[in-house]
């Protein structure tokens, strides 16, 4: 197991190139956003700690029909070691807080950039 932010990760954390690619994709989403991202869909907020990739996928997988985040969903699915389906929730969600997809993407991006700067990618 690799260490992510001091917590044991449930699976392999993406190496630097994969993490960089995910960051680039999230940057692309935030920069190219014209209308409200994903029609203003709301998703569960997550704890940006251990198991973050699976938790992020569990949140974003409940958004369908949003072409802007399809690649992000694919990437997160590749980083998460277990099968995730729509409607599935883990203890990693802040279940009383829903935020817009646009805010979710910004929060995730900030956290991933921090991890990348700290070299926490392998």
């Amino acid at each position: 197991l690799t260490c992510l932010g001091g917590f044991a990760s449930p699976g392999p954390v993406p190496p630097s190139t994969a993490l960089r690619e995910l960051i680039e994709e999230l940057v692309n989403i935030t920069q190219n956003q014209k209308a409200p991202l994903c029609n203003g869909s709301m998703v569960w907020s997550i704890n940006l700690t251990a198991g973050m990739y699976c938790a992020a996928l569990e949140s974003l997988i409940n958004v369908s029909g949003c072409s802007a985040i399809e690649k992000t969903q694919r990437m997160l699915s590749g980083f998460c070691p277990h099968k995730v389906s729509a409607g599935q929730f883990s203890s990693l969600h802040v279940r009383d807080t829903k935020i817009e997809v646009a805010q979710f993407v910004k929060d995730l991006l900030l956290h991933l950039k921090k991890l990348f700067r700290e070299g926490q990618f392998n």
Partner: antibody, heavy 118, light 111 residues
């Protein structure tokens, strides 16, 4: 419950345009992708194109120049228009909804039969 | 465009035996560790029905007699044991990249 229903003209003359409407119920078009798939008599399935919940579209490359897909979210309707019809456009036309990621096609209409003939 | 070639075009399998259908893609349908290949069953006069998604995941309500395997360009749908109700045409479909494409279909007859 999720339902999709196609309505088309049945018979279209060669060189004319085909317009089919897909009316859905049980879900909102803003949140799901709708595909168009056709099947010539006794033959296989051919993917025509789709419209995402957010309005983006993708098309079969061979038909792109004469195909358009649009929708009216408030009326829960998706529209297919195929121009310059030929006899080999004779087929059963289905509208079908994707599931969640990974966006396999989960729900299908019963299809509408279209014959191109003079 | 990704071309999907199914084989055989038709097959006849005895009740209780195993049916194996192959689908070969002209280029990989894998992306970020997943295979974007799905399988459908179509019976005469009916629309298709999703059986397997992401190469090997059984759709809810589909009997465990159906299974899928493979990655990159080579995929297999297996029905074991075959039942009379399985007589149908089976299609593979990829959505790794647009345009999405279907295989030509395999007609399964039960002996």
């Amino acid at each position: 419950q999720v339902q999709l229903k196609e309505s088309g003209p049945g018979l279209v003359a060669p060189s004319q345009s085909l317009s089919i409407t897909c009316t859905v119920s049980g879900f909102s078009l803003t949140g799901y992708n709708i595909n168009w798939v056709r099947q010539p008599p006794g033959k296989g399935l051919e993917w025509l194109g789709l419209i995402w919940g957010d309005g983006n579209t993708a098309f079969n490359s061979a038909l792109k120049s004469r195909l358009s897909i649009s929708k009216d979210n408030s009326k829960s309707q998706v529209f297919l228009k195929l121009n310059s019809l030929q006899t080999d456009d004779t087929a059963r036309y289905y509208c079908a909804r994707d599931g969640y990621y990974p966006y396999a096609i989960k729900y299908w209409g019963q299809g509408t039969s279209v014959t191109v003939s003079s | 465009n990704i071309v999907l070639t199914q084989s055989p075009a038709s097959l006849a399998v005895s009740l209780g035996q195993r049916a194996t259908i192959s689908c070969r893609a002209s280029e990989t349908v894998d992306s970020y560790g997943n295979s974007f290949m799905h399988w459908y069953q179509q019976k005469p006069g009916q629309p298709p029905k999703l059986l397997i998604y992401l190469a090997s995941n059984l759709e809810s309500g589909v009997p465990a007699r159906f299974s899928g395997s493979g990655s990159r360009t080579d995929f297999t749908l297996t029905i074991d044991p075959v039942e009379a109700d399985d007589a149908a045409t089976y299609y593979c479909q990829q959505n790794n990249e647009d345009p999405r494409t279907f295989g030509g279909g395999t007609k399964l007859e039960i002996k």
